[in-house]
C-alpha cells in the first residue's frame, strides 16, 4: 500500500496537493471517498489527489483483506 501511494504522490510536486493525497489514505469506515472529498474547499487539485489516493488505498485494503480471508480458510 505504502509503495503504491508513494508512487502516486510522487506525481504531485505542490506540497499541499501531495498532502491531500496522503489525507485520502487515512482509514475512515464511516464515509466513502466521495463523501470525504466533498468537504475539501482548497481546490480541485486537492480533490483529485485525495480521491485518487483514497480510492487506490481502499481497493488495496479490500484486496488484502480478501487474500487474508482466503488464507484463513
Amino acid at each position: 500500500l505504502q509503495e503504491k501511494i508513494e508512487e502516486i504522490a510522487a506525481k504531485y510536486k505542490h506540497l499541499v496537493v501531495k498532502k491531500c493525497c496522503y489525507d485520502g489514505v487515512r482509514i475512515n469506515h464511516d464515509e466513502t471517498c466521495e463523501q470525504r472529498a466533498a468537504r475539501i474547499s482548497v481546490g480541485p487539485r486537492c480533490v483529485k489527489a485525495f480521491t485518487e489516493c483514497c480510492v487506490v488505498a481502499s481497493q488495496l485494503r479490500a484486496n488484502n483483506s480478501h487474500k487474508d480471508l482466503q488464507l484463513g480458510r
Partner: antibody
Framework: QVQLVQSGAEVKKPGSSVKVSCKAS????????IHWMRQAPGQGLEWMGY????????NYNENFKGRVTITADKSTSTAYMELSSLRSEDTAVYYC???????????WGQGTTVTVSS | DIVLTQSPASLAVSPGQRATITCKAS??????????MNWYQQKPGQPPKLLIY???NLDSGVPARFSGSGSGTDFTLTINPVEAEDTANYYC?????????FGGGTKVEIK
C-alpha cells in the same frame, strides 16, 4: 470583499528578526493557502513560502535556509511571516497573497517595507 | 526548481501597437493537459495584480486587449492595442510545483 491587510513598515538592525502580519477578511480564512513573497528595491518577485491555515501545512523556499517561519492564527484570520538573522540584503517589500484553487494568486496584501540598516 | 526566463527585459511600444512578452520555462508546467502558468501586472508602488491564469484565462475586470497563449514550456502575454495605462512591469509565474517561481519581469513603457 476579499482583503489582505498587512502590518506597517519596519526598520531593523542586522542580526535581528522581523514579524510581518497579514489579516484576511471577506472569505473563509481556512479555505485558501497564504503565500509570502518579497521584492528587493528595483528587483523582481521572490517566493518565500506558504501556509495552509486549515491544516497548518507549510513549505518554504530553501534559499532562506531556515530563517523564515510562517504561522497562522485561525481565530483572528491572520497569517504571519517571521524572518530571522536579518541582513542588509533582506531590505525589501514583503507581500502576502492568497492562492486560489492551488493555481494562482488572486488577492495580494498592500506590502510591508522592511529596511535592515545598522 | 522550474526557472522562468522572460524576454525582453524591457519594451517600448507606441499606443495602439502590439506588445508581446514571452516566458520560457526550464521544464513543462503542464499536468494532464492543464498549464499552470499565470501573468501579473505591477505598477510602481503597488502590489502585483493578477491578469491571466492557467495560460489564457483573463481575471475578472481585466480588459480584453490582454491575452495569453502557450503550452508546455513556452508562453506569451500579448497586449493589443497597448494603452498608456499599461505602463508597468509584467511577471509570469508557475504554480505547478514548489517552489513557486516567477520570471524576472518585463518592463513595458509607452512611447
Amino acid at each position: 470583499q476579499v482583503q489582505l491587510v498587512q502590518s506597517g513598515a519596519e526598520v531593523k538592525k542586522p542580526g535581528s528578526s522581523v514579524k510581518v502580519s497579514c489579516k484576511a477578511s471577506g472569505y473563509t480564512f481556512t479555505d485558501h493557502i497564504i503565500h509570502w513573497m518579497r521584492q528587493a528595491p528595483g528587483q523582481g518577485l521572490e517566493w518565500m513560502g506558504y501556509i495552509y491555515p486549515r491544516e497548518g501545512w507549510t513549505n518554504y523556499n530553501e534559499n532562506f535556509k531556515g530563517r523564515v517561519t510562517i504561522t497562522a492564527d485561525k481565530s483572528t484570520s491572520t497569517a504571519y511571516m517571521e524572518l530571522s538573522s536579518l541582513r542588509s540584503e533582506d531590505t525589501a517589500v514583503y507581500y502576502c497573497a492568497r492562492e486560489r484553487n492551488l493555481e494562482y494568486f488572486d488577492y495580494w496584501g498592500q506590502g510591508t517595507t522592511v529596511t535592515v540598516s545598522s | 526548481d522550474i526557472v522562468l526566463t522572460q524576454s525582453p527585459a524591457s519594451l517600448a511600444v507606441s499606443p495602439g501597437q502590439r506588445a508581446t512578452i514571452t516566458c520560457k520555462a526550464s521544464q513543462s508546467v503542464d499536468y494532464e493537459g492543464f498549464n499552470y502558468m499565470n501573468w501579473y501586472q505591477q505598477k510602481p508602488g503597488q502590489p502585483p495584480k493578477l491578469l491571466i491564469y492557467a495560460t489564457s484565462n483573463l481575471d475578472s475586470g481585466v480588459p480584453a486587449r490582454f491575452s495569453g497563449s502557450g503550452s508546455g514550456t513556452d508562453f506569451t502575454l500579448t497586449i493589443n492595442p497597448v494603452e498608456a495605462e499599461d505602463t508597468a512591469n509584467y511577471y509570469c509565474q508557475q504554480s505547478l510545483e514548489d517552489p513557486h517561481t516567477f520570471g524576472g519581469g518585463t518592463k513595458v513603457e509607452i512611447k
